[in-house]
């Protein structure tokens, strides 16, 4: 019995088509993704193959004004155009609370919503249940199979589930779901979730009766074959794991941003054994017209958008100096209102012993690409802030050594006075230079606010301790020679969209005067 | 659980034909197919063809197609193999099956004698 | 027709031993290999498919890999329940094929 497995991930908020980088779409001949293209191939194949399941492995929240101004009501409305068979929670559909799930998502979806490893406890576990699941079990052609959600468990760091959530250990969580499956005389056993590549190789190995892994949350971009993009495959699609009682178990991702559309055909026996799996991306470009329909319903809801960008989101009663002569020279406070509110985004008490479970932000000069005049009224628009950081990344949470990081505070001014993007910006870091020394050598003083303390102050950077760091996705993936971050990183995690994370921060404060301060000297 | 249950031993005379069943059950019968697989004494195992139980459609060896028809009966989840012109040589058991060979029937003793 | 040619046809092995049995096709055949074991009263049973994933109950002392057109079966230290013949099937085109098959007899 063959199946066809349709999937997505990490498709945030990426509604509309983009540009080959998964940037705003400029030359609509080179765009690709986008729901209404993604539909096009999903129906070519739906009408071709007898047994199809689309997927998706969360994330869908977060990412472009879409979501700043929808909520989350456009991610339950286009996947429940699209048909969408089963989703399960990402870390970032809590990132405007349970509410901000319960009400646009959880209500409003026509496919079940799964994490095994999500428990509700308090007034929470009456109010959200029966809204998501652990498990479902579809009916596909003749067959039946069972899908089982999981989510990060380190989604209370990245996100804003409450205290009325516990986040399990996966593997702890999925097993006696699976093994439930198997007394209703499920056979065929997919895993569907949001917890990284790694994580989802340990799912495949570990959880008896897992017969497939769907995964999220690490972009992971698997390819047979020569890809067909600038994507750089990280193993074979499927990636196959050898689970620890004997069994070949398929894994698989799609990259990200809807990009991609997975598509993984399994042969199954009679026993529900994997007899064979072979597939690949689809790249979904221009040479897959748009849904006419599904265009026109894009277009439709666009338009709220577009009024939304020219509203007041808050005030400025300072020059929000953004421009290049002073943020790739000194600290300026374009750059200090981007850091604060990269950690103000990022406020997570979930340990008495800290105040916050990270304090620092580091921000490259030369992705701060305009500044904002307070003589026009004061008034900060999001069109304004889409001036400022253009280029549709996020701010990612990553654990680095204090060595490397003493590494990227060098590589900062190691040709100082070039205009070079990588001189970079602060929070929660005091940083003294002596551009007289030679390059490699000029960082004199780095003291670093601490996290477990009730009372935060700043101490010497320790080489061998591991920091948590907030900072652009384009630094944590090495841009601007920042190599040593991209090849230390010890852990990795994807965050909210740049604009979105300042714009929230504006409106919360109302009124805003970031000053220069002496975070770098 | 999967089950396959074969009909019992047959003799047979040469020129004859022979019609074997089998049937399944503890899963979905229609979503499958099944192989037929002869034995013949103190030898090693042959393929003969396989029919899918949902349409019917079958594939046969070479050495077998114009003798060898495989049909099915979706209302009792049985499927038949009927073996014709029947000679000494095709005195063997032969077996049913599933689709991926994870589950086989009893074996079916078929003797060709005159 | 991909003929597999199953080596040796029989062997003699003691209790606890480590035995290898191998499959050569005629050309590739992926993953498209099963083991089969037959036990004296003639019944069959699938210990591996795919080449390397074993089925439910088979003891994990068994296990198969390779790729391509060379294929093996290891049993990694002989049980008195594992006297028995074994082949392999290839299933990557029609018609499907079998090996001759490897007699394991007690030393």
């Known amino acids: 019995w063959e199946l066809t497995i349709l999937h997505t991930n990490d498709v945030h908020s990426r509604l509309e088509q983009t540009s080959e980088d998964s940037s705003k779409c400029v030359n609509a001949s080179r765009c690709m993704g986008g729901v209404a293209r993604l539909f096009t191939k999903v129906q070519q194949i739906r009408r071709a193959e007898p047994n199809v399941l689309l997927l998706d492995a969360g994330d869908q929240y977060q990412g472009t004004i879409w979501f700043t101004v929808y909520k989350g009501a456009e991610v339950a409305h286009f996947m429940n155009a699209l048909r969408y068979d089963a989703m399960a929670l990402g870390n970032h559909e809590f990132d405007n609370g349970v509410e901000g799930l319960i009400e646009p998502l959880l209500k409003e979806a026509k496919f079940p919503i799964l994490s095994a490893n999500i428990k509700a406890k308090g007034p929470l576990a009456s109010q959200i249940s029966g809204l998501y699941l652990p498990y479902k079990v579809l009916p596909v052609g003749d067959e039946v199979v069972g899908i089982v959600g999981y989510t990060s468990k380190e989604t209370p760091f990245l996100s804003n589930p409450g205290t009325n959530l516990v986040f399990e250990d996966e593997i702890t969580a999925l097993q006696p779901e699976v093994d439930k499956l198997k007394t209703l005389n499920v056979n065929k056993i997919i895993a569907l979730g949001h917890s990284g590549f790694e994580m989802d190789k340990l799912i495949a190995q570990k959880v008896r009766g897992v017969d497939v892994v769907v995964g999220g949350h690490s972009n992971t971009f698997l390819y047979t074959g020569n890809p067909p993009s600038k994507e750089v495959p990280a193993g074979k699609y499927p990636f196959i794991v050898t689970s620890d009682d004997g069994r070949k178990v398929p894994v698989v991702q799609a990259y990200a941003f809807g990009k991609y559309l997975g598509y993984l055909k399994i042969e199954f026996d009679e026993r529900g054994n994997v007899i064979s799996s072979h597939g690949n991306p689809i790249l979904l470009n221009s040479s897959i017209p748009e849904d006419p329909s599904i265009k026109a319903d894009i277009n439709k809801w666009r338009i709220k958008l577009d009024n939304y960008s020219t509203q007041e989101l808050g005030k400025t009663i300072v020059y929000l100096d953004g421009s290049s002569q002073s943020c790739r020279f000194r600290e300026c406070n374009m750059g200090n209102l981007i850091c604060d509110a990269m950690i103000n985004n990022n406020l997570r008490h979930t340990d008495e012993m800290f105040w916050n479970h990270v304090s620092m932000c580091i921000l490259n000069g030369g992705g701060i690409r305009s500044p904002i005049d307070e003589r026009n009224n004061g008034t900060i628009t999001w069109e304004n802030l889409a001036a400022v950081l253009p280029f549709g990344g996020t701010f990612d949470l990553v654990q680095l050594k204090g060595s490397t990081l003493k590494k990227a505070f060098e590589h900062s001014v190691h040709r100082y006075g070039q205009s070079t993007g990588e001189f970079l910006q602060v929070g929660g870091i005091h940083v003294v230079y002596d551009l007289s020394r030679k390059p490699g050598d000029r960082v004199v003083k780095l003291d670093v606010l601490c996290t477990k303390c009730r009372v935060p102050s700043y101490d010497p950077l320790k080489m061998d301790e591991v920091y948590k760091v907030i900072l652009p996705n384009f630094l944590a993936n090495g841009g601007d020679g920042f190599q040593m971050i991209k090849d230390e990183l010890l852990r990795h995690d994807s965050g909210d969209q740049d604009i979105n994370v300042v714009s929230t921060y504006i409106s919360k404060m109302k009124v805003i005067y970031p000053a220069v301060e002496g975070r770098i000297k | 659980e999967v089950q396959l249950v074969q009909s019992g031993a047959e003799v047979k005379k040469p020129g004859a034909s022979v019609k074997v069943s089998c049937k399944a059950s503890?899963?979905?019968?229609?979503?499958?197919?099944m192989n037929w697989v002869m034995q013949a004494p103190g030898q090693g195992l042959e393929w003969m063809g396989r029919?899918?139980?949902?349409?019917?459609?079958?594939f046969y060896s070479q050495k077998f197609k114009g003798r060898v028809t495989m049909t099915v009966d979706k209302s009792t989840s049985t499927v038949y193999m009927e073996l014709s012109s029947l000679r000494s040589e095709d005195t063997a058991v032969y077996y049913c099956?599933?689709?991926?060979?994870?589950?086989w029937g009893q074996g079916t003793t078929v003797t060709v004698s005159s | 027709d991909i003929q597999m040619t199953q080596s040796p046809s029989s062997l003699s092995a003691s209790v606890g031993d480590r035995v290898t049995i191998t499959c050569r096709a005629s050309?590739?055949?992926?993953?498209?290999l099963n083991w089969l074991q037959q036990k004296p009263g003639g019944a069959l049973k699938r210990l591996i498919y795919?080449?390397?994933s074993l089925d439910s109950g088979v003891p994990s002392r068994f296990s198969g890999s390779g790729s391509g057109t060379e294929y093996t079966l290891t049993i990694s230290s002989l049980q008195p329940e594992d006297f028995a013949t074994y082949y392999c099937?290839?299933?990557?085109?029609?018609?499907?094929?079998f090996g001759g098959g490897t007699k394991v007899e007690i030393k």
């Open positions: 503890g899963y979905t019968f229609t979503a499958y197919f």
């Open positions: 099937l290839q299933y990557a085109s029609f018609p499907w094929t």
């Open positions: 099956a599933t689709s991926y060979v994870g589950d």
């Open positions: 029919i899918y139980h949902n349409n019917g459609d079958t």
């Open positions: 050309q590739d055949i992926g993953d498209s």
């Open positions: 795919a080449t390397s």
